[in-house]
Protein backbone atom coordinates (compact mmCIF):
# COMPACT_ATOMS: atom_id res chain seq x y z
CA UNK A 1 0.00 0.00 0.00
CA UNK A 2 1.45 3.34 -1.03
CA UNK A 3 1.65 6.06 1.60
CA UNK A 4 -0.75 8.86 0.70
CA UNK A 5 1.48 11.67 1.91
CA UNK A 6 5.11 12.59 2.00
CA UNK A 7 7.11 12.27 5.23
CA UNK A 8 6.72 15.21 7.61
CA UNK A 9 8.76 18.32 7.01
CA UNK A 10 10.99 19.40 9.86
CA UNK A 11 12.38 22.94 9.67
CA UNK A 12 16.07 22.96 8.75
CA UNK A 13 16.17 19.18 8.38
CA UNK A 14 16.25 16.69 5.57
CA UNK A 15 15.36 13.03 5.53
CA UNK A 16 16.67 9.92 3.85
CA UNK A 17 15.64 6.32 3.59
CA UNK A 18 18.49 3.93 4.24
CA UNK A 19 16.73 1.23 2.26
CA UNK A 20 13.49 1.13 0.29
CA UNK A 21 10.73 -1.36 0.94
CA UNK A 22 9.48 -3.50 -1.92
CA UNK A 23 6.74 -1.60 -3.71
CA UNK A 24 8.52 1.75 -3.47
CA UNK A 25 8.45 3.69 -6.73
CA UNK A 26 10.87 6.32 -7.99
CA UNK A 27 10.07 8.88 -10.68
CA UNK A 28 12.13 8.54 -13.84
CA UNK A 29 12.97 12.16 -14.50
CA UNK A 30 15.67 13.92 -16.42
CA UNK A 31 17.53 17.16 -15.91
CA UNK A 32 16.80 20.23 -17.99
CA UNK A 33 17.61 19.72 -21.65
CA UNK A 34 16.98 15.98 -21.45
CA UNK A 35 13.87 13.82 -21.52
CA UNK A 36 12.90 10.22 -20.96
CA UNK A 37 13.27 8.06 -24.03
CA UNK A 38 9.88 7.45 -25.64
CA UNK A 39 9.67 3.82 -24.69
CA UNK A 40 11.23 4.46 -21.30
CA UNK A 41 9.69 3.74 -17.94
CA UNK A 42 7.85 6.40 -15.99
CA UNK A 43 8.90 4.88 -12.68
CA UNK A 44 11.39 2.46 -11.19
CA UNK A 45 9.87 -0.14 -8.86
CA UNK A 46 11.52 -1.93 -5.97
CA UNK A 47 10.56 -5.55 -6.40
CA UNK A 48 11.84 -8.97 -5.45
CA UNK A 49 11.37 -12.14 -3.48
CA UNK A 50 12.26 -13.16 0.04
CA UNK A 51 15.95 -13.46 -0.72
CA UNK A 52 16.67 -10.63 -3.12
CA UNK A 53 15.21 -7.24 -3.98
CA UNK A 54 16.13 -4.96 -6.86
CA UNK A 55 14.81 -2.08 -8.93
CA UNK A 56 12.69 -3.02 -11.93
CA UNK A 57 12.64 -0.78 -14.99
CA UNK A 58 15.57 1.41 -15.88
CA UNK A 59 15.31 5.14 -16.26
CA UNK A 60 16.91 6.48 -19.43
CA UNK A 61 17.34 10.06 -20.53
CA UNK A 62 18.14 11.44 -23.93
CA UNK A 63 18.91 14.93 -25.12
CA UNK A 64 15.81 16.93 -25.97
CA UNK A 65 17.68 18.43 -28.91
CA UNK A 66 18.43 15.12 -30.61
CA UNK A 67 16.00 12.66 -32.18
CA UNK A 68 15.90 8.89 -31.98
CA UNK A 69 19.06 8.60 -29.96
CA UNK A 70 19.84 7.56 -26.43
CA UNK A 71 23.34 8.99 -26.52
CA UNK A 72 24.02 10.36 -23.09
CA UNK A 73 26.60 12.77 -21.76
CA UNK A 74 28.35 12.00 -18.51
CA UNK A 75 27.59 14.78 -16.02
CA UNK A 76 30.49 17.05 -15.19
CA UNK A 77 31.63 17.15 -11.54
CA UNK A 78 29.93 20.50 -10.96
CA UNK A 79 26.67 19.09 -12.32
CA UNK A 80 26.88 16.17 -9.95
CA UNK A 81 27.59 18.50 -7.04
CA UNK A 82 24.38 20.42 -7.58
CA UNK A 83 22.27 17.30 -7.01
CA UNK A 84 20.02 17.72 -4.04
CA UNK A 85 17.00 15.84 -2.84
CA UNK A 86 14.66 15.90 0.08
CA UNK A 87 15.79 12.34 0.68
CA UNK A 88 19.41 13.44 0.98
CA UNK A 89 20.51 11.17 -1.80
CA UNK A 90 24.11 10.12 -1.55
CA UNK A 91 26.42 7.65 -3.23
CA UNK A 92 27.24 6.35 0.25
CA UNK A 93 25.84 2.85 0.76
CA UNK A 94 25.73 1.59 4.35
CA UNK A 95 26.63 -2.08 4.29
CA UNK A 96 23.70 -2.91 6.55
CA UNK A 97 21.33 -1.95 3.75
CA UNK A 98 22.04 -5.09 1.82
CA UNK A 99 21.15 -7.32 4.74
CA UNK A 100 17.67 -5.95 5.23
CA UNK A 101 15.29 -8.41 3.56
CA UNK A 102 12.53 -7.09 1.34
CA UNK A 103 14.31 -3.82 0.69
CA UNK A 104 16.21 -2.24 -2.18
CA UNK A 105 19.35 -0.16 -1.98
CA UNK A 106 19.49 3.41 -3.21
CA UNK A 107 19.28 3.09 -7.00
CA UNK A 108 22.49 4.09 -8.72
CA UNK A 109 22.29 7.38 -10.60
CA UNK A 110 21.39 7.26 -14.26
CA UNK A 111 22.94 9.61 -16.77
CA UNK A 112 21.37 13.04 -16.90
CA UNK A 113 18.81 12.36 -14.19
CA UNK A 114 16.98 15.26 -12.57
CA UNK A 115 18.55 17.00 -9.59
CA UNK A 116 15.75 15.88 -7.28
CA UNK A 117 14.56 12.33 -6.72
CA UNK A 118 10.89 11.79 -5.98
CA UNK A 119 10.07 8.55 -4.18
CA UNK A 120 6.62 7.10 -3.54
CA UNK A 121 6.89 5.16 -0.31
CA UNK A 122 4.90 2.20 0.98
CA UNK A 123 3.52 1.37 4.42
CA UNK A 124 6.27 0.32 6.79
CA UNK A 125 8.91 2.58 5.24
CA UNK A 126 11.17 4.35 7.68
CA UNK A 127 13.05 7.57 6.95
CA UNK A 128 15.75 9.20 9.05
CA UNK A 129 16.15 12.91 9.70
CA UNK A 130 19.24 15.05 10.08
CA UNK A 131 19.65 18.76 10.60
CA UNK A 132 21.11 20.61 7.65
CA UNK A 133 24.53 22.18 7.83
CA UNK A 134 24.67 25.04 10.31
CA UNK A 135 21.96 23.59 12.56
CA UNK A 136 22.19 21.12 15.38
CA UNK A 137 19.72 18.59 16.66
CA UNK A 138 17.73 18.87 19.85
CA UNK A 139 15.61 15.79 20.35
CA UNK A 140 14.22 13.58 23.07
CA UNK A 141 13.10 10.75 20.85
CA UNK A 142 13.85 9.08 17.55
CA UNK A 143 14.73 11.34 14.64
CA UNK A 144 12.83 9.12 12.27
CA UNK A 145 9.39 8.70 10.80
CA UNK A 146 7.51 5.58 9.80
CA UNK A 147 4.60 5.30 7.40
CA UNK A 148 1.83 3.44 9.22
CA UNK A 149 -1.63 2.23 8.32
CA UNK A 150 -4.26 3.38 10.81
CA UNK A 151 -8.01 2.91 10.39
CA UNK A 152 -7.43 2.17 6.72
CA UNK A 153 -5.52 5.40 6.14
CA UNK A 154 -1.81 5.95 5.92
CA UNK A 155 0.08 8.47 8.02
CA UNK A 156 3.66 9.22 9.00
CA UNK A 157 4.75 9.30 12.62
CA UNK A 158 6.13 12.61 13.81
CA UNK A 159 9.90 12.65 14.27
CA UNK A 160 11.07 13.98 17.63
CA UNK A 161 13.59 16.41 16.23
CA UNK A 162 14.17 20.14 16.46
CA UNK A 163 16.99 21.76 14.53
CA UNK A 164 18.40 24.93 15.97
CA UNK A 165 20.99 27.33 14.61
CA UNK A 166 24.34 27.19 16.41
CA UNK A 167 23.97 30.79 17.57
CA UNK A 168 20.33 30.44 18.61
CA UNK A 169 20.98 28.54 21.80
CA UNK A 170 22.95 29.25 24.95
CA UNK A 171 22.77 25.70 26.23
CA UNK A 172 25.95 23.81 26.97
CA UNK A 173 26.73 20.90 24.67
CA UNK A 174 24.42 18.01 25.37
CA UNK A 175 21.87 20.14 27.16
CA UNK A 176 18.45 20.20 25.54
CA UNK A 177 16.12 23.10 25.07
CA UNK A 178 12.59 22.45 26.38
CA UNK A 179 10.61 20.98 23.52
CA UNK A 180 7.00 21.55 22.63
CA UNK A 181 4.82 18.57 21.88
CA UNK A 182 5.25 17.36 18.31
CA UNK A 183 2.57 18.17 15.79
CA UNK A 184 -0.16 15.64 15.23
CA UNK A 185 -1.80 13.29 17.66
CA UNK A 186 0.25 11.53 20.33
CA UNK A 187 0.68 7.84 19.65
CA UNK A 188 -1.43 7.02 22.70
CA UNK A 189 -4.51 8.49 21.04
CA UNK A 190 -4.39 5.83 18.37
CA UNK A 191 -6.34 3.01 19.92
CA UNK A 192 -6.98 0.80 16.93
CA UNK A 193 -4.54 -1.64 15.42
CA UNK A 194 -1.56 -0.06 13.73
CA UNK A 195 0.10 -2.25 11.14
CA UNK A 196 3.74 -1.76 10.42
CA UNK A 197 6.29 -4.15 9.12
CA UNK A 198 9.87 -4.75 10.17
CA UNK A 199 9.75 -1.72 12.46
CA UNK A 200 11.96 -3.42 15.01
CA UNK A 201 14.62 -4.55 12.59
CA UNK A 202 14.79 -1.12 11.01
CA UNK A 203 15.05 0.52 14.43
CA UNK A 204 17.92 -1.80 15.26
CA UNK A 205 19.52 -1.01 11.94
CA UNK A 206 19.14 2.69 12.64
CA UNK A 207 20.88 2.33 15.95
CA UNK A 208 23.87 0.60 14.41
CA UNK A 209 24.07 3.19 11.66
CA UNK A 210 23.53 6.21 13.85
CA UNK A 211 27.12 7.31 13.86
CA UNK A 212 27.80 6.73 10.19
CA UNK A 213 24.76 7.33 8.02
CA UNK A 214 25.01 11.08 7.84
CA UNK A 215 28.73 11.62 7.44
CA UNK A 216 28.46 13.07 3.96
CA UNK A 217 27.97 16.82 3.61
CA UNK A 218 24.90 17.72 1.58
CA UNK A 219 24.77 21.02 -0.25
Amino acid sequence: ELCDDDPPEIPHATFKAMAYKEGTMLNCECKRGFRRIKSGSLYMLCTGNSSHSSWDNQCQCTSSATRNTTKQVTPQPEEQKERKTTEMQSPMQPVDQASLPGHCREPPPWENEATERIYHFVVGQMVYYQCVQGYRALHRGPAESVCKMTHGKTRWTQPQLICTGEMETSQFPGEEKPQASPEGRPESETSCLVTTTDFQIQTEMAATMETSIFTTEYQ
Epitope: L2, D4, D6, M25, N27, L42, I118
Partner: nanobody
Protein backbone atom coordinates in the same frame (compact mmCIF):
# COMPACT_ATOMS: atom_id res chain seq x y z
CA UNK B 1 -4.58 4.78 -2.94
CA UNK B 2 -4.70 6.89 -6.06
CA UNK B 3 -8.01 7.16 -7.91
CA UNK B 4 -8.03 8.17 -11.57
CA UNK B 5 -11.21 9.17 -13.40
CA UNK B 6 -11.16 9.82 -17.14
CA UNK B 7 -13.77 11.73 -19.09
CA UNK B 8 -14.23 13.42 -22.44
CA UNK B 9 -14.41 10.43 -24.75
CA UNK B 10 -17.05 10.03 -27.43
CA UNK B 11 -17.80 9.62 -31.11
CA UNK B 12 -16.15 12.06 -33.49
CA UNK B 13 -15.70 12.30 -37.24
CA UNK B 14 -12.29 12.00 -38.86
CA UNK B 15 -10.44 15.29 -38.63
CA UNK B 16 -12.36 16.25 -35.52
CA UNK B 17 -11.13 16.97 -32.00
CA UNK B 18 -11.69 15.73 -28.46
CA UNK B 19 -10.25 16.71 -25.12
CA UNK B 20 -9.81 14.00 -22.53
CA UNK B 21 -9.45 14.75 -18.84
CA UNK B 22 -8.10 12.62 -16.03
CA UNK B 23 -8.74 13.71 -12.47
CA UNK B 24 -6.50 12.21 -9.80
CA UNK B 25 -7.06 12.00 -6.07
CA UNK B 26 -5.44 10.32 -3.11
CA UNK B 27 -1.92 11.65 -3.45
CA UNK B 28 -0.04 14.90 -3.95
CA UNK B 29 -0.58 15.34 -7.68
CA UNK B 30 2.46 17.50 -8.28
CA UNK B 31 4.78 14.59 -7.44
CA UNK B 32 3.31 12.32 -10.12
CA UNK B 33 4.37 11.55 -13.66
CA UNK B 34 1.16 11.06 -15.63
CA UNK B 35 0.58 9.02 -18.75
CA UNK B 36 -2.14 8.46 -21.33
CA UNK B 37 -2.34 5.01 -22.88
CA UNK B 38 -4.77 3.50 -25.35
CA UNK B 39 -5.93 0.07 -26.34
CA UNK B 40 -7.64 -0.63 -29.65
CA UNK B 41 -9.73 -3.80 -30.08
CA UNK B 42 -7.50 -6.82 -30.50
CA UNK B 43 -4.34 -4.82 -29.90
CA UNK B 44 -1.97 -4.31 -27.02
CA UNK B 45 -2.17 -1.27 -24.83
CA UNK B 46 0.23 1.40 -26.05
CA UNK B 47 1.69 4.56 -24.60
CA UNK B 48 0.29 7.72 -26.18
CA UNK B 49 1.81 10.56 -24.16
CA UNK B 50 3.35 11.30 -20.79
CA UNK B 51 3.98 14.45 -18.82
CA UNK B 52 6.47 14.98 -16.05
CA UNK B 53 6.07 17.04 -12.91
CA UNK B 54 7.50 20.11 -14.54
CA UNK B 55 5.33 19.74 -17.63
CA UNK B 56 7.80 18.13 -20.03
CA UNK B 57 5.78 16.03 -22.50
CA UNK B 58 6.69 12.92 -24.45
CA UNK B 59 4.61 11.61 -27.36
CA UNK B 60 4.33 8.45 -29.39
CA UNK B 61 5.36 9.04 -33.00
CA UNK B 62 1.86 8.18 -34.19
CA UNK B 63 0.30 11.15 -32.38
CA UNK B 64 3.08 13.72 -32.42
CA UNK B 65 1.89 17.04 -33.81
CA UNK B 66 -1.77 16.08 -33.37
CA UNK B 67 -2.10 15.37 -29.63
CA UNK B 68 -1.09 17.63 -26.76
CA UNK B 69 -0.76 16.53 -23.15
CA UNK B 70 -0.95 19.10 -20.36
CA UNK B 71 -1.54 19.21 -16.63
CA UNK B 72 -3.12 21.51 -14.09
CA UNK B 73 -1.59 20.80 -10.69
CA UNK B 74 -4.08 23.08 -8.96
CA UNK B 75 -6.94 20.93 -10.27
CA UNK B 76 -5.13 17.59 -9.95
CA UNK B 77 -5.94 16.95 -13.60
CA UNK B 78 -4.10 15.91 -16.73
CA UNK B 79 -5.52 16.56 -20.20
CA UNK B 80 -5.08 15.08 -23.64
CA UNK B 81 -6.10 17.39 -26.46
CA UNK B 82 -6.62 15.29 -29.58
CA UNK B 83 -6.81 17.07 -32.94
CA UNK B 84 -6.95 15.80 -36.52
CA UNK B 85 -8.33 12.51 -35.29
CA UNK B 86 -8.08 9.45 -37.52
CA UNK B 87 -9.99 6.17 -37.56
CA UNK B 88 -6.87 4.43 -36.26
CA UNK B 89 -7.09 6.56 -33.11
CA UNK B 90 -10.22 4.62 -32.13
CA UNK B 91 -9.52 2.95 -28.78
CA UNK B 92 -10.20 3.02 -25.08
CA UNK B 93 -7.96 5.70 -23.57
CA UNK B 94 -6.56 5.15 -20.10
CA UNK B 95 -4.88 7.44 -17.63
CA UNK B 96 -2.06 5.97 -15.57
CA UNK B 97 0.25 6.95 -12.76
CA UNK B 98 2.41 4.90 -10.43
CA UNK B 99 0.78 1.46 -10.57
CA UNK B 100 -2.74 2.83 -10.89
CA UNK B 101 -4.98 2.88 -13.97
CA UNK B 102 -8.20 4.72 -14.62
CA UNK B 103 -11.28 2.88 -15.87
CA UNK B 104 -10.81 4.21 -19.41
CA UNK B 105 -12.88 6.33 -21.76
CA UNK B 106 -13.93 5.22 -25.24
CA UNK B 107 -12.89 7.30 -28.24
CA UNK B 108 -14.42 6.34 -31.58
CA UNK B 109 -13.38 8.07 -34.80
CA UNK B 110 -15.79 7.24 -37.58
CA UNK B 111 -17.75 8.91 -40.32
Amino acid sequence: EVQLVESGGGLVQPGGSLRLSCAASGRRFSTLIMGWYRQAPGKQRELVATIERGGTPTYADSVKGRFTISRDNAKNTVYLQMNSLRPEDTAVYYCKTLRYWGQGTQVTVSS
